[in-house]
């Protein structure tokens, strides 16, 4: 698994470097997670032909994966820093159950899957420090998450492969949209 942000050799070799600002740390953290997703997608795509499926075909699924919409205030039209930040944190919290599902779904990239999960937890903490209106953030219900996890794990092999692919692609898209918005804050 790659080394977490702030612990790579370049950082060690340059102790005089200015410490990262909160925004830079968040930016680096998201890019680190995106690298992890990229590695996981490689394994998934090598293992099945899901990656060749059209977006339209994949859209026909029952997963309720978080997605950015116009009303979330993260796009240029209607951009709203506070609303957007709440959406990013809420979305990441909702993704956690799906990241838990990804554990044990990878053979050669098991560590990588764990790194993506743990790095996301750290990212949520960074973002919660940045948010002013923490009351607006709804945390998913643990019981609901537990039953969702059980349901996903009970699927047949083909559906599990499809689910894995969809989670990775949706999570990547959510992080990209989040970072685009965060870079405007």
């Amino acid at each position: 698994a790659p080394v977490p942000p702030g612990e790579d050799s370049k950082d060690v070799a340059a102790p005089h470097r200015q410490p990262l600002t909160s925004s830079e740390r968040i930016d680096k953290q998201i890019r680190y997670i995106l690298d992890g997703i990229s590695a996981l997608r490689k394994e998934t795509c090598n293992k099945s032909n899901m990656c060749e499926s059209s977006k339209e075909a994949l859209a026909e699924n029952n997963l309720n994966l978080p997605k950015m919409a116009e009303k979330d205030g993260c796009f240029q039209s209607g951009f709203n820093e506070e609303t957007c930040l709440v959406k990013i944190i809420t979305g990441l919290l909702e993704f956690e159950v799906y990241l838990e599902y990804l554990q044990n779904r990878f053979e050669s990239s098991e560590e990588q899957a764990r790194a993506v999960q743990m790095s996301t937890k750290v990212l949520i903490q960074f973002l919660q420090k940045k948010a002013k209106n923490l009351d607006a953030i709804t945390t998913p219900d643990p019981t609901t998450n537990a039953s969702l996890l059980t349901k996903l794990q009970a699927q047949n092999q083909w559906l599990q492969d499809m689910t894995t692919h969809l989670i990775l692609r949706s999570f990547k898209e959510f992080l990209q949209s989040s970072l685009r918005a965060l870079r405007q804050m």
């Epitope: 995106l34 796009f75 240029q76 990547k172 990209q176 949209s177 970072l179 685009r180 870079r183």
Partner: nanobody, 124 residues
Framework: EVQLVESGGGLVQPGGSLKLSCTTS????????VGWFRQAPGKEREFVAD????????WYAESVLGRFTISRDDAKNTVYLEMNGLKPEDTAVYYC?????????????????WGQGTQVTVSS
């Protein structure tokens, strides 16, 4: 890194239009975010517009909002910048840049590959 080539620049009268293209032969260009920047003589390079890996996610500088449109055709490995209602102050060398993370943004540091630029001159 990907090799980027801009084209479509030229001389145009105020109020006129141009469509710039940014092309690469690199695979997986569809996964890159692409930004357009411009640099007028004696001025700093400035952000114009960008498009994420998801084509619906675009962002524009205030000065071009409503006049310029950024779009992508992943089948052709090309990103376009359609410029309407051109003004003399739009005169500059226009550069496209790519971000392998598919994110982009309004700062040069977010991009890891750059083209050589194409000249746009708006004059009567």
């Amino acid at each position: 890194e990907v090799q980027l080539v801009e084209s479509g620049g030229g001389l145009v009268q105020p109020g006129g239009s141009l469509k710039l293209s940014c092309t690469t032969s690199g695979r997986r260009f569809s996964e890159y975010a692409v930004g357009w920047f411009r640099q007028a003589p004696g001025k700093e390079r400035e952000f114009v517009a960008d498009i994420g890996e998801q084509a619906e996610n675009t962002w524009y500088a205030e000065s071009v909002l409503g006049r310029f449109t950024i779009s992508r055709d992943d089948a052709k490995n090309t990103v376009y910048l359609e410029m309407n209602g051109l003004k003399p102050e739009d005169t500059a060398v226009y550069y496209c840049a790519a971000d392998k993370y598919g994110v982009g943004g309004n700062a040069q540091g977010y991009y890891d590959s750059w083209g050589q630029g194409t000249q746009v001159t708006v004059s009567s």
